[in-house]
Amino acid sequence: AVDLTLLANLRLTDPQRFFLTCVSGEAGAGRGSDAWGPPLLLEKDDRIVRTPPGPPLRLARNGSHQVTLRGFSKPSDLVGVFSCVGGAGARRTRVIYVHNSPGAHLLPDKVTHTVNKGDTAVLSARVHKEKQTDVIWKSNGSYFYTLDWHEAQDGRFLLQLPNVQPPSSGIYSATYLEASPLGSAFFRLIVRGCGAGRWGPGCTKECPGCLHGGVCHDHDGECVCPPGFTGTRCEQACREGRFGQSCQEQCPGISGCRGLTFCLPDPYGCSCGSGWRGSQCQEACAPGHFGADCRLQCQCQNGGTCDRFSGCVCPSGWHGVHCEKSDRIPQILNMASELEFNLETMPRINCAAAGNPFPVRGSIELRKPDGTVLLSTKAIVEPEKTTAEFEVPRLVLADSGFWECRVSTSGGQDSRRFKVNVKVPPVPLAAPRLLTKQSRQLVVSPLVSFSGDGPISTVRLHYRPQDSTMDWSTIVVDPSENVTLMNLRPKTGYSVRVQLSRPGEGGEGAWGPPTLMTTDCPEPLLQPWLEGWHVEGTDRLRVSWSLPLVPGPLVGDGFLLRLWDGTRGQERRENVSSPQARTALLTGLTPGTHYQLDVQLYHCTLLGPASPPAHVLLPPSGPPAPRHLHAQALSDSEIQLTWKHPEALPGPISKYVVEVQVAGGAGDPLWIDVDRPEETSTIIRGLNASTRYLFRMRASIQGLGDWSNTVEESTLGNGLQAEGPVQESRAAEEGLDQ
């Protein structure tokens, strides 16, 4: 069963001091990661017992394995059902506590009733404040039965439930007619899925014979031990004030477990701690009684004395529950109540015995759950005991269950049952996850879900280059931390697999499925520098750069140009996808802006060092384009251009710029300044005869403006080859006079 305890502090003078604590003794409980177990949950269950709304309750986590609920403001907040959920996966378990109001009309004689399938359960509600009306019994909040108030027997109303079955389990309550449901007596009925002493799917298996009020779990045959007892059969008492499956927890406060109710996984239910009884667990056991709720009687023999926490304390020479066994009778010594081995291992199990006559090797045997008897392979004889060693054949899952060590001598016999848990080594169900990669390292999350049993003690990461036959490299990592695989080859695929281990010999599981993880390219190392830049317009910038000369091939796929506009806090990135490029035209920039410019080489997704930055000021935006540009050939070497001034000028034009290009030519265009801004005509001279030219122009104020439309015109025929175009400008009217 899951090691989960719900404690209720029943010192009820002040509801604000009331608290519920859920404690888990499970490994890794409450850590909250899906792979290693969900957190503990503690809440009030309002589905059956509804209380008036109040301020929300406060939940406080104390480490990973304890959670406490506080913040109760009035007594009615306490009434009802509380539950704690803990454990992971198939072991997820709900522990339930039912709280009754001490001032209720009716009070339960006993809150938790655990019965076997087919038994008769009797719930008894004691009259605390009489009311001469019917009594309504409810099951899980719905009407179940009714009694006339005259039917009370000895001041109690009884509900008899014959031949109970597991579906009868639940919360029962007894309430007077016309009385608040918060004044009900609340009960919890737990019906085991099997008859007395049986467990398993068809109830075919025999329970181990739980001692000290332990209850046999109908699913796994384990004893759920009362608080204060431990061992496979609950045969061992904890020290006073301790609880938990291994007595590992301690009751809070100076008065130990006084005033605390303990609720454990079904089919146990709730009780006071060992040595205490009463509705508020504040009364010590009467002489001769011990254990949880003081339900057990000592009946010590041979001078034994009764301890209310542990039962009979035997004088020298005697042992047994009632000190009924003489130390001359052989006795199994210090046998662990539970052993854990991994599947397919061949463990050695030791069993020690003492007695008079002294046990020898042949008098000690080991019996498996299937009835197979193993004889010891060797024995170590010491003055006070004989220890027999058994070599167990390769374990299979069916070996899980109760084993028994038995010693027989002429003085009598003794046997001790112990639980063997055969655990399946964990196997990852998924491949590890790649978190980040670099050229020579991969960062991997090894945390994966797994089949088989935890806890995970170690995680091994195996890796090697893809399609390689070389040995796997292995790294052992902490299960909860990411791992960095280092000193890898760049741009290489690696096969990566996880292997999980649980504690103990043979705890290594099979390797999980592989996954392919590829390292990044090598980082580019060369640092370019900016050769220069040229403003080609208010929003255009031509940039050129160089790289240092190094031997070998260039490591890079291209260049990244970055322009930082500090005023607006904006970055512009331009990708040049050829590693051979050394120049780029940046367009669509913001006129009149101060940019910081740099360039860096990239390879795959990695960037090399950036060039030292340059600072570039783009001129402000220029005027609109000149209108109605027209070209007219005057001779075999002259063409006249006419235009109209741009509209809506932001200021006086300083000059015009004419662009001349041979149509279909591959060469760079020629720019000619017209320095008299009042002109609306100019003659371009020195052109080649019978040649088709393209013209466009723009005005300049503080910066160059937009281009006009492009016009075409051909010079007249067969003149001599000119040296190159020049211009002469006049007022338009003069040009026409010529």
């Epitope: 509804r50 309504i136 009407y143 039965y145 009714t146 009694l147």
Partner: antibody, heavy 127, light 107 residues
Framework: EVQLLESGGGLVQPGGSLRLSCAAS????????MSWVRQAPGKGLEWVSG????????TYADSVKGRFTISRDNSKNTLYLQMNSLRAEDTAVYYC????????????????????WGQGTLVTVSS | DIQMTQSPSSLSASVGDGVTITCRAS??????LNWYQQKPGKAPKVLIY???SLQSGVPSRFSGSGSGTDFTLTISSLQPEDFATYYC?????????FGQGTKVEIK
Amino acid sequence: EVQLLESGGGLVQPGGSLRLSCAASGFTFSKYRMSWVRQAPGKGLEWVSGIYPSGGGTTYADSVKGRFTISRDNSKNTLYLQMNSLRAEDTAVYYCARPTYYYDSSGYYYSGPIDYWGQGTLVTVSS
Amino acid sequence: DIQMTQSPSSLSASVGDGVTITCRASQSINNHLNWYQQKPGKAPKVLIYAASSLQSGVPSRFSGSGSGTDFTLTISSLQPEDFATYYCQQSYSTPWTFGQGTKVEIK
């Protein structure tokens, strides 16, 4: 579907006895209170007797106290009314009835109406 | 025992009329009053419980009110199937007692 079927009615002389039965089906008979209600020809309804699920608690109208006995057999899902020292004024249709409880929004339970009735059986007391 | 007095003992009305029947208890019964409808040769059928709560499946033209000793059953608009005898009953204490009945006839 809840069904209540009365039987055992008939003609009986004054001072005589009769035992009425009511066979219940369609609900868990052993969990509910049951009652007998009668109606004299052309007259109103009169509650006669009631019994709790265990059979331990019984109540009677003053007019029948000491003469009539209500009982039940939960294993047979049957309600009985043993009528002794019958009088002419006991002539009536006898209904087997199941009263209910109801609860309010706060969860308080109250004794409610008779929500299921049989079809009735006629008892005639006459010489 | 608690006496229940119903009035009127009979009334004539037409389809569509509104009808009110009253019931008085000889002592306070809080709201533990139920109303039944009975047609000739049939068993009674519960209409209203707890003085004003409409039983499931009963048309909303039926309504109840009152508390303590005085209670009322109202049929807001009589339908042909509503012509029957109506009884009040207290479930406050045993013996449970019924009113003598009110017969609603067609005018």
